[in-house]
């Protein structure tokens, strides 16, 4: 039994990293395996995690922190029974996928405008609390060609748009997506997404003069 | 050994500043979030805020906002909290405290004492 | 702010015999990560605090096993299940879970 692909983990930098493997060959990862994580600092207890597997050979295991800090520096053993399999470390502040925003709402009791709001991933007391930005992906159920990405560069986990930059009388999707550019992690995965139905009443002398911007990520 | 030996008792006036200093020895402050928690004579445990040494981000007890200031040097391995427009409600035993993720480690207490 | 409320203020208790102390949490400490950060930590006279207990119910290193803890949500207990003259001093519950943080007022525990 060889590990094919080496284990390679990011972190939520809350309390999640996830470490992903291949073995050279189909594996019952639960059984055959374990991972062995532990922070290198004072009174730092060894912990085991059970994979479970990603696919035939794959691997997948997610260690839980109780905190994380910019210095963490974890040591990783992987172990088949008594074989050590593979040594190797893993520094979660270099390895970020921030968290999914949630609670993704569209407001559309103001006229003409359309709010978006949603929550911030992360509590006050987390380095990304702060230092997120977002992006916002506007699409139409019934025109794929309608797609937008909205980039959000301040902190507020806010969006607002015209009504009239979208087409009246049909139904649009959103979700929401972070990234934190101070350790230049990843993009989260999207929120799920929500569903409303954009109506507003446009003056006649303006219809069909709109002209749309759309953004492509 | 694990050690935080913190600087000396101070005697302030009131509107003054006071910076106390929380040097830590057998860790590097790096790899913990370095806290601060005020005990006034004969009272219990206030949380007063803490910093990430490494990347210098810090919260505060809204109590102590605006008037609290934490820093770091981690060159030195030393917390500081400096502490302005004194008080005779600041006088208090300030101590130092590693938190990883619990408060494992305390400083030995820096007495200040607000009197005119 | 989640305030940390304790019951009792104080106890005088006999050698050998048990103590029990409540803290109460005025919402739920419970982290977003779904770990609860309870502390307890005990303020012998003239010294700084020490870890007690920590995550409801995990003894620290060289905590003696009288020790011990337990609750969820927003009820929690520390119990000595045998008191000894070393264990004066004044208790304090803490939460660790959301900003700002939080202790106790404390009990103060005496020998009879």
């Known amino acids: 039994m060889k590990v094919l692909q080496e284990p390679t983990c990011v972190s939520d930098y809350m309390s999640i990293s996830t470490c992903e493997w291949k073995m050279n060959g189909p594996t019952n990862c639960s059984t055959e395996l374990r991972l062995l994580y532990q922070l290198v600092f004072l009174l730092s207890e060894a912990h085991t995690c059970i994979p479970e597997n990603n696919g035939g050979a794959g691997c997948v295991c997610h260690l839980l922190m109780d905190d994380v800090v910019s210095a963490d520096n974890y040591t990783l053993d992987l172990w088949a029974g008594q074989q050590l399999l593979w040594k190797g470390s893993f520094k979660p502040s270099e390895h970020v996928k921030p968290r999914a925003p949630g609670n993704l709402t569209v407001h559309t009791n103001v006229s003409d405008t359309l709010l978006l709001t949603w929550s911030n991933p992360y509590p006050p007391d987390n380095y990304l609390y702060n230092h997120l930005t977002y992006a916002v992906n506007i699409w139409s159920e019934n025109d794929p060609a309608d797609f937008r990405i909205y980039n959000v560069t301040y902190l507020e986990p806010s969006l607002r748009i015209a009504a009239s930059t979208l087409k009246s009388g049909i139904s649009y999707r959103a979700r929401v997506r972070a990234w934190a550019q101070c350790y230049n992690t990843t993009w989260s995965e999207w929120s799920p997404s929500t569903k409303w139905h954009n109506s507003y009443r446009e003056p006649f002398e303006q219809h069909h003069h709109h002209h749309h911007h759309h953004h492509h990520h | 050994e694990v050690q935080l030996v913190q600087s000396g008792a101070e005697v302030k006036k009131p509107g003054a500043t006071v910076k106390i200093s929380c040097k830590a020895s057998g860790f590097n402050i790096k790899d913990t979030y370095m806290h601060w928690v005020k005990q006034a004579p004969g009272k219990g445990l206030e949380w007063v805020g803490r910093i990430d040494p490494t990347n210098g981000y810090t919260i505060y007890a809204s109590k102590f906002q605006g008037r609290a200031t934490i820093t770091a040097d981690t060159s030195s391995n030393t917390a500081y909290m400096e502490l302005s427009s004194l008080r005779s409600e600041d006088t208090a035993v300030y101590h130092c405290?590693?938190?990883?993720?619990?408060?494992?480690?305390w400083g030995q207490g820096t007495l200040v004492t607000v009197s005119s | 702010d989640i305030v940390m409320t304790q019951t009792p203020l104080s106890l005088s208790v006999t050698p050998g015999q048990p103590a029990s102390i409540s803290c109460r949490s005025s919402?739920?400490?419970?982290?977003?990560?779904?770990?609860?950060?309870l502390e307890w930590y005990l303020q012998k006279p003239g010294q700084s605090p020490q870890l007690l207990i920590y995550?409801?119910?995990n003894r620290f290193s060289g905590v003696p096993d009288r020790f011990s803890g337990s609750g969820s949500g927003t009820d929690f207990t520390l119990k000595i299940s045998r008191v000894e003259a070393e264990d004066v001093g004044v208790y304090y519950c803490f939460q660790g879970s959301h900003v700002p943080y939080t202790f106790g007022q404390g009990t103060k525990l005496e020998i009879k």
């Open positions: 995550k409801v119910t």
């Open positions: 919402q739920s400490i419970v982290h977003s990560n779904g770990n609860t950060y």
């Open positions: 405290v590693s938190r990883r993720p619990w408060f494992a480690y």
